[in-house]
């Protein structure tokens, strides 16, 4: 399977909210002994590989923001902890998962990564990630609403 990032760049005004999205593509094994772990974190375009470094989003680590379920179940993160930080990550039945960030500030600007781990018990973990940039702007040049820019290549790099 792969991860698609429909948009590679989100440009938003301060105070707005944004929903960053990733989508699972391709054959997804829904077998009994396969489960999925999905999460979000901030990163940098590192020397070795984009998304290899995992930084917190508003002080919440990728452990705090993870989603866990079988191949075809919807899931949400621990609501209270995330909502206190103006965050919510969610996943639907169709392979799409997202993180919503409310009340954006300039400090939210940066590179965001979604990570999907297909856990094939008795065999291995299969990791794929997607990356997108968030730019939060202020002042007269800032847009009135979020503007999104489609990815030139929607498939993320498969890193297994």
């Amino acid at each position: 399977f792969k991860v698609a990032t429909p948009y590679s760049l989100y440009v938003c005004p301060e105070g707005q909210q944004v929903t960053l999205t990733c989508r699972l593509l391709g054959p997804v094994d829904k077998g009994h002994d396969v489960t999925f772990y999905k999460t979000w974190y901030r990163s940098s375009r590192g020397e070795v590989q984009t998304c290899s470094e995992r930084r917190p989003i508003r002080n919440l680590t990728f452990q705090d923001l993870h989603l866990h379920h079988g191949g075809h179940q919807a899931a949400n993160t621990s609501h209270d902890l995330a909502q206190r930080h103006g965050l919510e990550s969610a996943s639907d039945h169709h392979g799409q998962f997202s993180i919503t960030m409310r009340n954006l500030t300039l400090l939210d600007s940066g590179l965001y990564c979604c990570l999907v781990v297909e856990i094939r018990h008795h065999h291995s973990e299969h990791r794929v990630h997607g990356a997108m940039e968030l730019q939060v702007q202020t002042g007269k040049d800032a847009p009135s609403n979020c503007v999104v820019y489609p990815s030139s290549s929607q498939d993320s790099e498969n890193i297994t």
């Epitope: 489960t35 993870h66 866990h68 990570l115 781990v117 018990h121 065999h123 973990e125 990791r127 890193i159």
Partner: antibody
């Protein structure tokens, strides 16, 4: 802050079954892998196996025929059973949280189990 | 299973010196390798994950590098609390395996 605490008998007779329990406090057991790792005196670390929150298990092939790991989410506990023990099973047994695509980030303090008659 | 070989088995150094520890895998583990520190009577503590990322709260003097089969943990300037045993661990597939450890002792 998640903490792990192992409990169980410190002495087991040869051929009997070693039974240990790990209690998870300060966080949910309903996610991640929950693993057992052991360390014989003066030696290195050996992964025994895990139970995933969903109930799926995975054991080290070298111990698979003797190992059972189970979980009781209502008590926030997971347990290890190792049958037909010998002196070679004498070790410090650790429980640990293992996060997918990450590492063993939280460990119990370990419990010494001696196999002797 | 993947065998991890650590060298040297023992490293005798003085505080302030640089420590370089090696871990070699019997087959490629990509960059899915962690490093742990263990002091006598204590559980291991995670230092590095994915070959070069420091875990939360780990001082900058600890750094990891490498990919494929050859990895290095470097302690740029040894502090008294750094004298311990260090283990590498792979997670590209199961069973998860650890190296035999490198003991960093005071010279």
């Amino acid at each position: 802050q998640v903490q792990l605490q192992e409990s169980g008998p410190g002495l087991v007779k040869p051929s009997e079954t070693l039974s240990l329990t790990c209690t998870v406090s300060g966080g949910s057991i309903s996610s991640y892998y929950w693993s057992w790792i052991r360390q014989p005196p003066g030696k290195g670390l050996e992964w025994i196996g895990y139970i995933y929150y969903s109930g799926s298990t995975n054991y080290n092939p070298s111990l698979k025929s003797r190992v059972t790991i189970s979980v009781d989410t209502s008590k926030s506990q997971f347990s290890l059973k190792l049958s037909s023990v010998t002196a070679a099973d004498t070790a410090v047994y650790y429980c640990a949280r293992d996060i997918p695509a990450f590492a063993f980030d939280i460990w119990g303090q370990g419990t010494m189990v001696i196999v002797s008659s | 299973e993947i065998v991890l070989t650590q060298s040297p088995a023992t490293l005798s150094l003085s505080p302030g010196e640089r420590a370089t520890l090696s871990c070699r895998a019997s087959q490629s583990v990509s960059y899915y390798l962690a490093w742990y520190q263990q002091k006598p009577g204590q559980a291991p503590r995670l230092l590095i994950y994915d070959a070069f990322n420091r875990a939360t709260g780990i001082p900058a003097r600890f750094s990891g590098s490498g990919s494929g089969t050859d990895f290095t943990l470097t302690i740029s300037s040894l502090e008294p609390e750094d004298f311990a045993v260090y283990y590498c661990q792979q997670r590209i597939n199961w069973p998860l395996t650890f190296g035999g450890g490198t003991k960093v002792e005071i010279k």
